[in-house]
């Protein structure tokens, strides 16, 4: 069955980072357009991206309503220019997406080191808490608000003069590490959800930040550099 001269979508793929969630599919349309529907397992279908010639649809607004639900989407194909005249008795061809559970499957975005501060032989490294599009009432929630203690950060640090890396972990957004006096160190962090068992349990590493550059501050030297 299906509507004349339309091809069903295929390769439906969820692309999601920090809950920003886009459904992508193929093929690039030739004389056809698409409409996407999304639902939870127990809910009704909701249509989005009506009669679009794109091959992607931003479904963030839907999935952030409950990031712990499991969602299914489907993409309908319609002949371009004949959308309204499609016979109501004939269902257009469509393809289902894989199931998607945002809380378990959204990728962790690349974290950012907000600041570091040296006091004697201790350095406090702070990771910036990223905002998401998940809301509570009318307030946007941070990554930490959503994941809580499920989310940890791993810090990689090393002397600027050597390549031997050390690691530290925290379930907050701060590290307090011991360093050698008079040595400059470089830092990189990674977000991790240890309870995940798949490839998306870790983010990519943050950009490297090194002492002696703009991001930190040192009480030893009296130079204060604040990063905003």
């Amino acid at each position: 069955s299906g509507t004349t001269n339309t091809v069903a979508a295929y390769n439906l793929t969820w692309k999601s980072t920090n809950f920003k969630t886009i459904l992508e599919w193929e093929p690039k349309p030739i004389n056809q357009v698409y409409t996407v529907q999304i639902s939870t397992k127990s809910g009704d279908w909701k249509s989005k991206c009506f009669y679009t010639a794109d091959t992607e649809c931003d479904l963030t607004d839907e999935i952030v309503k409950d990031v712990k639900q499991t969602y299914l989407a489907r993409v309908f194909s319609y002949p371009a220019g004949h959308v309204e005249s499609t016979g109501s008795t004939e269902e257009p061809p469509y393809e289902n997406s894989p199931e998607f559970t945002p809380y378990l499957e959204t990728n962790l975005g690349q974290p950012t080191i907000q600041s570091f501060e040296q006091v004697g032989t201790k350095v406090n490294v702070t990771v910036q808490d990223e905002w998401t599009l998940v809301r509570r009432n009318d307030t946007f929630l941070s990554l930490r608000d959503v994941f809580g203690k499920d989310l940890i950060y791993t810090l990689y640090y090393w002397k600027s003069s050597s390549s031997g890396k050390k690691t530290a972990k925290t379930n907050t957004n701060e590290f307090l590490i011991d360093v050698d006096k008079g040595e400059n160190y470089c830092f990189s962090v990674q977000a991790v959800i240890p309870s995940r068992r798949t490839a998306n349990r870790k983010s990519t590493d943050s950009p490297v930040e090194c002492m002696g550059h703009e991001k930190g501050e040192s009480r030893e030297t009296g130079h204060h550099h604040h990063h905003h």
Epitope: K68, D129, L141, R144, V146, G148, K149, R197
Partner: antibody
């Protein structure tokens, strides 16, 4: 409606094992931690640990490591607590609870509790 | 482990009274990332499971009456019942929901005077 329904009371002899079940309904079982809490008669609450059904990932209170085991069967949306080598001090009500929607937002839903009595 | 200490252990009060229960933690429960305090309050009545009242130190769980309020930051927290109702006589527990192992206070039993 979210519900956690626990198995019935158990009377066990010292040295035996017990397995308490917690059947969840009304929500996506795999995405919420199931917490286990012990309450001895007339005493306060003691967190035993938790399990995330999606991955089977667990956290244990050191006081219960070794004798308590958490498991979950996602096909029937049920979590289990098994305690081996039972002692008199294991006599208690055991609760399962579900974590809140937001991060670190408490135990939002609780089972009715299962009384385990250990007596010779 | 984070120790949670509640005071008083028991308290007698009358309907209509304003009641305050305090909870101290041995370490800060303030999350630097989002500036939230991961302190939770529960109410438990005899023979029943505990009920979540307050999370994030001051956020009321949906359906909890507005006479219950939570405050505090870092290591010092308070649960206040502005005007006691007959159904409020119960035992109240605070909980560290910040870091493993999660720990409860020993409880405060609120009795009718």
């Amino acid at each position: 409606e979210v519900q956690l329904v626990q198995s019935g009371s158990e009377l066990k002899k010292p040295g035996a094992s017990v397995k308490v079940s917690c059947k969840a309904s009304g929500y996506t079982f795999i995405t919420y931690w199931i917490e286990w809490v012990k309450q001895r008669p007339g005493q306060g609450l003691e967190w035993m640990g938790d399990i995330l059904p999606y991955s089977g990932s667990t956290n244990y209170n050191e006081n219960f490591k070794g004798r308590a085991t958490f498991s979950a069967d996602t096909s029937v949306s049920t979590a289990y607590l098994q305690i081996s080598s039972l002692k008199a001090e294991d006599t208690a009500v055991y609760y399962c609870a579900r974590s809140g929607y937001y991060g670190n937002s408490g135990f939002a839903y609780w089972g009715q509790g299962t009384l385990v009595t250990v007596s010779s | 482990d984070i120790q949670m200490t509640q005071s008083p252990s028991s308290l007698s009060a009358s309907v209509g009274d304003r009641v305050t229960i305090t909870c101290k933690s041995s370490q800060s429960l303030l999350s630097s990332g989002n500036q939230k305090n991961y302190l939770t309050w529960y109410q438990q009545k005899p023979g029943k499971a505990p009920k979540l009242l307050i999370y994030w130190a001051s956020t009321r769980e949906s359906g909890v009456p507005s006479r219950f309020s939570g405050s505090g930051s870092g290591t010092d927290f308070t649960l206040t019942i502005s005007s006691l109702q007959p159904e409020d006589f119960a035992t109240y527990y605070c909980q560290n929901d910040y870091t493993y192992p999660l720990t409860f206070g020993q409880g405060t039993k609120l009795e009718i005077k």
